[in-house]
């Protein structure tokens, strides 16, 4: 997941942007000002922390916004959070503009925030446990030269009158061809629905879509159907968003 | 719908102070400013300031800086302006009006019915 | 602070007939609103930022201009039109024109 990504203001309008607790948002307000705009001055919420940045030094703003600065091609915004927010859109940093006279503003931008906490997790050393947001997954790589969460090939045959060994099909027929596989688990965090616009996607890229297959379990309560979401032409997931706190199961296999 | 009821009328004498109200419903109070606009009878339309409810910040016309101090209760949704010292030059009709920096460019798009303050011993 | 000056002060038309008002400022403005007040009740915003017009208002009713000068049109005057329109503009401190009074004939 990108660790940072940059969101566009424009004056007169309100920007809705998911945030996901430990990265980064920038925002350029140069580029978002009014003509005639000199200064600019910001407010935000109290879960909300902004750094003014300029020729890469950056100021912490208070919430207050009683500060004003200049406005300069190389002044942009950082915006982090500290916590999920319990209700979409609910935080916001706002853009004021002010003209030469300086005295009030003449136009504002908004960016409302919507902060969630995602955390896709593996028993990376396959005690039986699916630890936490393990600190070290950003340095994981994949390959036979890799580190991180071991993966067992799923090569044997559960269902030894069908054909093909089990990581060969798309199809899981017994619970006992899920023990051969790594359980992942995805945390999430955060208000009852997101903006329009935004949902959760898994994915996997071309080149690692013939090595990994993933599975859901639909049901788990009764009827249970293993679904087949990632791998082979699959390359894309989208996750269902149910708000609050979350984990959904799934079954990964090499 | 969006709705900012004032009170009709305020008699006052002079040299005393009235605290005006305007009670916002059919919206999220605290998303949009709210200014404060003086008619004189038969005259024009003079802006006298704003304030944001979510976190009280205002601004004022120099002219108005000594005579008017606006105020919001979030709880009920409610704007103040409270005018001292008055004189005659003070009666007029005042306006509250609702203004969203993200839509209508700015302009003041939902407007009171207005009070009509009197002074007069 | 930007004046803005509103002409003419009163303004007498026949039905069906086409007017155009026009609000001139000292100095340069980004953009003009421009509000409808009838008699006894509380301003109404007609146009927002120069050009655009505001919802239920009816298509008679249009703006155009840039810098120091704006005018509002009405393509065709109806009896229910009669009242006081204010240009407002926002750079600066907010100003209001004087405003013009229509009246039909």
């Known amino acids: 997941m990108l660790r940072e990504r940059t969101v566009r203001l424009q004056y007169g309008s309100r920007v809705e942007a998911v945030y996901v607790l430990g990265t980064y948002l920038w925002t350029d307000v140069y580029s978002a000002a009014p003509a005639g705009a000199q200064t600019f001055s910001l407010k935000h919420s109290e879960h909300v922390w902004v750094e003014v940045v300029r020729d890469g030094e950056a100021e912490e703003v208070a919430t207050n916004g009683k500060q004003r600065w200049l406005l300069s091609p190389s002044t942009t915004l950082r915006v982090t959070m500290s916590q999920a927010s319990t209700e979409a859109s609910s935080d916001k940093v706002t853009v004021n503009y002010y003209d030469e006279e300086g005295s009030i503003p003449i136009d504002q931008a908004g960016l409302f925030l919507t902060a969630i906490e995602i955390s896709l997790d593996v028993d990376a050393d396959r005690d039986g446990v699916v630890e936490k947001n393990n600190p070290k997954k950003a340095s994981w790589t994949w390959g036979p030269e890799g580190q991180g969460a071991i993966l067992l090939v799923n090569c044997d045959r559960e269902t030894p009158w069908l054909p093909k060994e089990d990581c060969r099909d798309e199809k899981v027929y017994s619970k006992e061809d899920l023990k051969d596989m790594s359980q992942m688990i995805l945390r999430t965090k955060g208000p009852d629905r997101l903006p329009a616009g935004y949902e959760i996607v898994l994915y996997i890229s071309m080149s690692d879509s013939d090595k990994v297959g993933v599975f859901y379990v639909e049901n788990p309560f009764f009827g249970q159907r293993y679904i087949h979401i990632l791998g082979r032409r699959k390359l894309y997931h989208v996750v269902k968003y149910t708000g609050g706190s979350a984990e959904l199961l799934f079954f990964v296999e090499g | 719908q969006v709705q900012l009821q004032q009170p009709g009328a305020e008699l006052v004498r002079p040299g005393a102070s009235v605290k005006l109200s305007c009670k916002a419903s059919?919206?999220?109070?605290?998303?949009?400013?709210m200014n404060w606009v003086k008619q004189r009878p038969g005259q024009g339309l003079e802006w006298i300031g704003m304030i944001d409810p979510s976190d009280s910040e205002s601004y004022y016309n120099q002219m108005f800086k000594d005579k008017a101090t606006l105020t919001v209760d979030k709880s009920s949704s409610t704007a103040y302006m409270q005018l001292s010292r008055l004189t005659s030059e003070d009666s007029a009709v005042y306006y509250c009006?609702?203004?969203?920096?993200?839509?209508?460019?700015?302009?003041?798009?939902?407007w009171g019915q207005g009070t009509s303050v009197t002074v007069s011993s | 602070q930007i004046v803005l000056t509103q002409s003419p002060a009163i303004l007498s038309a026949s039905l069906g007939e086409e007017i155009t008002l026009t609000c001139s400022a000292n100095s340069s403005a980004r953009y003009m609103h421009w509000y409808q007040q009838k008699s006894g009740t509380s301003p109404k915003l007609l146009i927002y930022s120069t050009s655009n017009l505001a919802s239920g208002v009816p298509s008679r009713f249009s703006g155009s201009g840039s810098g120091t000068f704006y005018s509002l049109t009405l393509s065709s005057v109806e009896a229910e039109d009669a009242a006081d329109y204010y240009c407002h503009q926002w750079s600066g401190y907010p100003t209001f024109g004087g405003g013009t009074k229509l009246e039909i004939k």
């Open positions: 059919g919206y999220t109070f605290t998303s949009y400013w």
């Open positions: 009006a609702r203004k969203d920096y993200y839509a209508y460019g700015g302009a003041m798009d939902y």
